[in-house]
């Protein structure tokens, strides 16, 4: 609450999280021209990466291009891609939405299309649908463990959202545990309001706002943190300003001296922790 | 501007970055002792590293050190890094300047000079210059979206820089469009009075600021981001202090058995997003 | 200062790294079931990672499990784990402490011990101690550059910590150098009152806070920055609620085309930037 | 460019000795053996740094091949004992700068073992 009389400060924060938590997939493998079921398993190693700061990211969806080499190909036959002759195709051309250079030659994609040439890592990537149900989507069970020290130099004080009584084995609730900083990613969603099944499919942000109130004076000293979520990308976003939360990224190798690699667009979750908050003294 | 009845708020705020693009570069490749021109293409996945928060990266330039292995091996022939006797190389001394640790014994590196051996990744990196004109120039004509999520939460205000009746295939101007938050990054730079295909060799910083001025009042409401671009890393620095932006990074491997990898010094333009601004209200 | 009749604002701040320094790693190395001390040299690309934004980190210890696979094996014994009959073992069960998903059976870890079988990156991780001492604890003399960029737009003042004048090869001290922005990681922990050599073997996150107090009337004009140190995780947190700083990260790879991966548990510092302070003008 | 004499090679029965040597035009760091069998990629063989620091050999030869240098000569030697019919191939000598990596490389002499 405002106390007029009070110095406020702004709050200096760092923050720390741990993701726990194991995921069970089961997708279609071909190999050798035969589609099986194959069933993996993903720890945190293999669907968060190592990132600093006040943002955590959890996979939970991706789509695999495999064995993609650098050469000539026919572009992905998307819609208004399709060509009838080499005059629909422009040497040199870097159309946006494409993955290559255009050769300036129209040739068959499949038994029934045509497209443009393009010099690229092929074959291409498909633009097909992000898998339906998510494919981690058990990563709604995955907890995060969040560490916040904050520091008002004005006032010199500082303190963490951790404290010595605190029980390493909690969950964050909202009425029966609200200053426990081990969170469940489905009820982070939830108390958002969000689906976090239907997130999972195309990814989002969702954002973990800390807040510290702080009274600093001794007489009624109070300075633990408010924690509270919301989601941060619009969920009613037009395609062509790239709705969810993806990104790419590959695993280069060789493969009988071929320089390869394996294109994995990621979809997930990223989590923004939002620090704010002021120390007031009189 | 300011209204000294309202009661001001610093704004809270969320970033999400998307950057397109594909890049032809043409370079040297020497292969089994012949050197010739090598064309390859690089997509997103090449050129940008899955990053979190306010900044993005763009590589525009690079120099591999290929196939380096644990080993002992001359160090590169630096400036005043020569030697003549094993005198001159101190067993367990590491030069900040270079690459390993000596031996104690000064060896040949070529015909006419001499270095202290090392134990290093050999061979060690050569300090050449960065290529110019810089490898991914045609970087210039990459485009980045921006999504920016705002809050003010003592007001218990949320916005967003992109409305539903944004166009997805706008381009950033500062006269016909300065609304659209799709940026080419050559029209950053040059907003910014700087030479894309120049800072494209060493690399740097651009910082996009993204001020937020917001009168929450209903009666005279606006609360629409102004965008601003200024270079952020200082072009007349001195080079002990690493003018440019650049980073290392390595790809392992294994080869007959024995642990390899390739060096990248990548070179390229990291984007900061700076958001900032308050919301008024009575 | 506190001037009243000025209009305070608060510093937007961007900031780069660069780490310098190179470290002999001695480890056992066990291959074809004979074991033999190791040396190997790790410089930057080996340490710290390609990192945005106000933070950085670096390597000082780690843990390796190689050669995993994807396949079915006994969990790891730690406290609690073991079972006698598989009736302790509960099918499609995950354990958050445990690295994979229950099949139902107990079976032989070893000769006088029995666990649950799990599906898992297989053998599942040993959850031994983090070496000691660390096997970086030489990174205690890698230094960082810190290039800082500050502007109070409101007051259109731009400034850096790093001016013209300044000498490449200094070192931060204190009282004989408080302007140089080149910190020996070791003084950094000196300067918080913490002890490296300690800290390197289970990581934590140290603050290095730059506070600018800038005065921007012309007739007495100030703007410099002021480094101070402090760590900010808590040394003496519960085992539960995970002391130090560690992530796990793994290298994928194919052997006789069988999907592989080595998992580091990588543990270090994290040193967190944290830039505030205010410019006041009339 | 470096230029590389190979000297010594021959026939031999298995279990025989042979003695290979290298000239170099110039000084070079790390001096090697590589070797090709008819049919098959060039493969490393053995290779010395500066004054026979450090050494370094193929799993297939170790304990039957010791090479050595004489730096103020730019020659390396590879002494070649318990040969077997598949050590036949053309052995060339190479140069480079480190014992991983080579560069230059000779014409070659040819290793005939017979059984």
């Known amino acids: 609450s405002d106390k007029l009389y009070q110095r406020k400060e702004p709050v200096i924060s760092s923050v720390h999280t741990k993701v726990k938590g194991i995921a069970e997939v089961t997708e279609n493998v071909t190999e050798g021209g035969v589609t099986k079921l194959g069933h993996s398993i993903f720890d945190t190693a293999d669907y968060t990466f190592p990132l600093q700061g006040n943002s955590f990211f959890v996979m939970t969806n991706y789509v695999k291009s495999e064995g993609q080499v650098q050469t000539l190909c026919p572009e992905y036959p998307r819609r208004g891609a399709q060509c009838s002759s080499d005059r629909r195709c422009k040497k040199g051309w870097m159309d946006p939405q494409s993955k290559g250079i255009q050769t300036g030659r129209c040739v068959p994609y499949d038994k029934t299309r045509k497209t443009c040439e393009v010099s690229a890592w092929c074959p291409t990537e498909e633009e097909k649908e992000a898998p339906r149900p998510a494919l981690l989507r058990s990563a709604e069970n995955f907890t995060v463990l969040i560490k916040n020290n904050i520091h008002f130099p004005g006032h010199n004080y500082t303190t963490r959202n951790i404290l010595p009584t605190m029980n390493g084995s909690c969950t964050f609730h909202k009425t029966w545990d609200p200053q426990c900083s081990i969170f469940r990613l489905g009820d982070i969603f939830q108390e958002a309001g969000e689906n976090f099944t239907e997130v999972a499919v195309q990814g989002g942000i969702m954002g973990i706002e800390i807040y510290w109130d702080c009274n600093l004076d001794s007489w009624s000293h109070h300075c633990r943190p408010r924690y509270s979520f919301r989601r941060l990308d619009d969920k009613n976003m037009d395609e062509s300003f790239v709705p969810g939360y993806n990104f790419r990224y590959a695993k280069y190798y060789k493969e009988n001296n071929v320089e390869k690699r394996t294109l994995i667009k990621a979809f997930g979750i990223r989590f923004d922790i939002l620090v704010f908050g002021t120390g007031g003294k009189f | 501007s300011d209204k000294l009845y309202q009661r001001k708020e610093p704004v809270i705020s969320s970033v999400h970055t998307k950057v397109k693009g594909i890049a032809e570069v043409t370079e040297n490749v020497t292969e089994g002792g012949v050197t010739k021109l090598g064309h390859s293409i690089f997509d997103t996945a090449d050129y940008t590293f899955p990053l979190q928060g306010n900044s993005f990266f763009v590589m525009t330039n690079y120099v591999k050190s290929e196939g380096q292995v644990q080993t002992l091996c001359p160090e590169y022939p630096r400036r005043g890094a020569q030697c003549s006797s094993d005198r001159r190389c101190k067993k367990g001394w590491m030069d900040p300047q270079s690459k390993g640790i000596q031996t104690g014994r000064c060896v040949p590196y070529d015909k006419t000079r001499k270095t202290c051996e090392v134990s290093a990744w050999c061979p060690t990196e050569e300090e050449k210059e960065a290529p110019r004109p810089a490898l991914l120039r045609s970087a210039e004509n990459f485009t980045v979206l921006i999504k920016n999520n705002i809050h003010f939460p003592g007001h218990n205000y949320t916005t967003r820089n992109i409305l539903p009746t944004m166009n997805g295939s706008c381009t950033f101007h500062k006269t016909w469009d300065p609304q659209c938050s799709i940026f080419r990054l050559g029209d950053i730079f040059q907003e910014a009075g700087e030479n894309f295909t120049e800072v494209a060799v060493q690399g740097g910083i651009m910082g996009i600021e993204i001020y937020w001025d917001c009168n929450l009042d209903s009666w005279s409401h606006h609360c629409r981001p102004r965008y601003s671009f200024r270079r952020l890393d200082d072009k007349n620095m001195d080079e002990s202090f690493v003018p440019g932006y650049n980073f290392r990074y390595a790809k392992y491997y294994k080869e007959n058995n024995v642990e390899k990898r390739t060096l990248i010094k990548a070179f390229g333009i990291r984007f900061d997003i700076l958001v900032f601004g308050t919301g008024g209200k009575f | 200062s506190d001037k009243l009749y000025q209009r305070k604002e608060p510093v937007i701040s961007s900031v780069h790294t660069k780490v310098k320094g190179i470290a002999e790693v001695t480890e056992n190395v066990t291959e074809g079931g004979v074991t033999k001390l190791g040396h190997s040299i790790f410089d930057t690309a080996d340490y710290t990672f390609p990192l945005q934004g106000n933070s950085f980190f670096v390597m000082t210890n780690y843990v390796k499990s190689e050669g995993q696979v994807q396949t079915l094996c006994p969990e790891y014994p730690r406290r609690g784990a073991q079972c006698s009959s598989d009736r302790r073992c509960k099918k499609g069960w995950m354990d958050p402490q445990s690295k994979g998903i229950q099949t139902g059976r107990c079976v032989p870890y070893d000769k006088t011990r029995k666990t649950c079988e799990v599906s898992a990156w297989c053998p599942t991780e040993e959850e031994k101690e983090a070496p000691r001492p660390a096997l970086l604890r030489s990174a205690e003399n890698f230094t960082v550059l810190i290039k800082n960029n500050i502007h109070f737009p409101g007051h259109n003042y731009t400034t850096r910590n790093i001016l013209p004048t300044m000498n490449g090869s200094c070192t931060f001290h204190k009282t004989w150098d408080p302007q140089c922005s080149i910190f020996r990681l070791g003084d950094i922990f000196q300067e918080a009152g913490e002890n490296f050599t300690e800290v390197a073997v289970q990581g934590g996150i140290m603050g290095i806070e730059i506070y600018w107090d800038c005065n921007l009337d012309s007739w007495s004009h100030h703007c410099r920055p002021r480094y101070s140190f402090r760590r900010l995780d808590d040394k003496n947190m519960d085992e539960s609620f995970v002391p130090g700083y560690n992530f796990r990260y793994a290298k994928y790879y194919k052997e006789n085309n069988v999907e592989k991966r080595t998992l580091i548990k990588a543990f270090g510092i994290r040193f967190d930037i944290l830039v505030f302070g205010t410019g006041g003008k009339f | 460019e470096v230029q590389l004499v190979e000297s010594g090679g021959g026939l031999v029965q298995a279990g025989g000795s042979l003695r290979l040597s290298c000239a170099a035009s110039?000084?070079?760091?790390?001096m090697g053996w590589f070797r090709q069998a008819p049919g098959k990629e060039r493969e490393f063989v053995a290779g010395?740094?500066?004054?026979?620091?450090?050494?370094r050999y193929a799993d297939s030869v170790k304990g039957r091949l010791t090479i050595s240098r004489d730096n103020a000569k730019n020659t390396v030697s590879l002494q070649m004992s318990g040969l077997k019919p598949e050590d036949t191939a053309i052995y060339y000598c190479?140069?480079?700068?480190?014992?991983?990596?080579?560069?230059?490389w000779g014409q070659g002499t040819q290793v005939t073992v017979s059984s």
């Open positions: 110039e000084r070079t760091y790390s």
């Open positions: 010395s740094g500066w004054d026979g620091i450090p050494t």
């Open positions: 190479a140069t480079g700068t480190s014992v991983y990596h080579y560069q230059y």
